[in-house]
């Protein structure tokens, strides 16, 4: 289970992204509109320091459908 303020690395990070993003898919790096971040991606944001669910969701490929 994923709790707030955890670090996620490797297979655990992939599994969590697959769960959070479901059939939407996900990116390891956000599209280049955030070019000022340069190489920083989900690995740096969530493995090298703790991150939350909201941040994880920003790496999903398409926005969640609103009910």
């Amino acid at each position: 289970a994923y709790g707030p303020g955890e670090t996620l690395c490797g297979g655990e990070l992939v599994d969590t992204l697959q769960f959070v993003c479901s059939d939407r898919g996900f990116y390891f790096s956000r599209p280049s509109s955030r070019a000022n971040r340069r190489s920083r991606g989900i690995v740096e944001e969530c493995c090298f320091r703790s991150c939350d669910l909201a941040l994880l969701e920003t790496y999903c490929a398409t926005p969640a459908k609103s009910e």
């Epitope: 670090t7 690395c9 990070l13 190489s39 690995v43 493995c47 090298f48 320091r49 703790s50």
Partner: antibody, heavy 119, light 112 residues
Framework: QVQLQESGPGLVKPSETLSLTCTVS????????WSWIRQPPGRGLEWIGY???????NYNPSLKSRVTMSVDTSKNQFSLKLSSVTAADTAVYYC?????????????WGQGATVTVSS | QSVLTQAPSVSGAPGQRVTISCTGR?????????VHWYQQFPGTAPKLLIY???NRPSGVPDRFSGSKSGTSASLAITGLQAEDEADYYC???????????FGGGTKLTVLG
């Protein structure tokens, strides 16, 4: 327990490409992050880059134009190529692994491969 | 010049407590990125000593401890032993450089 072993030529000529391979045993290459680090004689550690098997890579900006990292999942190996080498690239090269149980710390290291750049 | 600054050397007598500091900035340690510490003996590969600022991998004695505050981190060694004589490196991630960074290393000498 994951174990790493570097291999490659110990001597490379200036302007040529340095090529090293890291063989992984005791774990799957598709589960972890993989790094290369080097240490020039008598100096400190320098991060070269890391990658995830999916293709996600990040290289040291000072070396980025010369570095390529790749993975061969069938052989459970990953490799480093550093082009246009000079004497300043003489170092012990280490491959290392971030298994994910150590919050991004490199918890498994190879024993190191000494590479000398000389004509 | 390393992005993470460490004193080149530190020394202490057996049984004493020594601390090794690692000073960063707002783009690395101060940005919340974890600090890791490595121990390296001459001619051997580094070994992870402390991860995630203050956690010890299994097998590392509890004489070794890590802490982090603001833009700095520290490694403390209590009950210093002759076999602790080695080089110690801190490591973190730097968002302005978009990469991992190491400190320059601190050589620990155990006196006597």
């Amino acid at each position: 327990q994951v174990q790493l072993q570097e291999s490659g030529p110990g001597l490379v000529k200036p302007s040529e490409t340095l090529s090293l391979t890291c063989t992984v045993s005791g774990g799957s290459i598709s589960s972890y992050y993989w790094s290369w680090i080097r240490q020039p004689p008598g100096r400190g550690l320098e991060w070269i880059g890391y990658f995830f098997y999916s293709g996600y890579t990040n290289y040291n900006p000072s070396l980025k134009s010369r570095v390529t990292m790749s993975v061969d999942t069938s052989k459970n190996q990953f490799s480093l190529k550093l082009s246009s080498v000079t004497a300043a690239d003489t170092a012990v090269y280490y491959c290392a692994c971030i298994t994910g149980t150590t919050k991004g710390g490199m918890d498994v290291w190879g024993q190191g491969a000494t590479v000398t750049v000389s004509s | 010049q390393s992005v993470l600054t460490q004193a080149p050397s530190v020394s202490g007598a057996p049984g004493q407590r020594v601390t090794i500091s690692c000073t960063g900035r707002s783009s690395n340690i101060g940005a919340g990125y974890d600090v890791h510490w490595y121990q390296q003996f001459p001619g051997t590969a580094p070994k992870l000593l402390i991860y995630g600022n203050s956690n010890r991998p299994s097998g590392v004695p509890d004489r070794f401890s890590g802490s982090k505050s603001g833009t700095s981190a520290s490694l403390a060694i209590t009950g210093l032993q002759a076999e602790d004589e080695a080089d110690y490196y801190c490591q973190s991630y730097d968002s302005s450089l978009s990469g991992s960074v190491f400190g320059g290393g601190t050589k620990l000498t155990v006196l006597g």
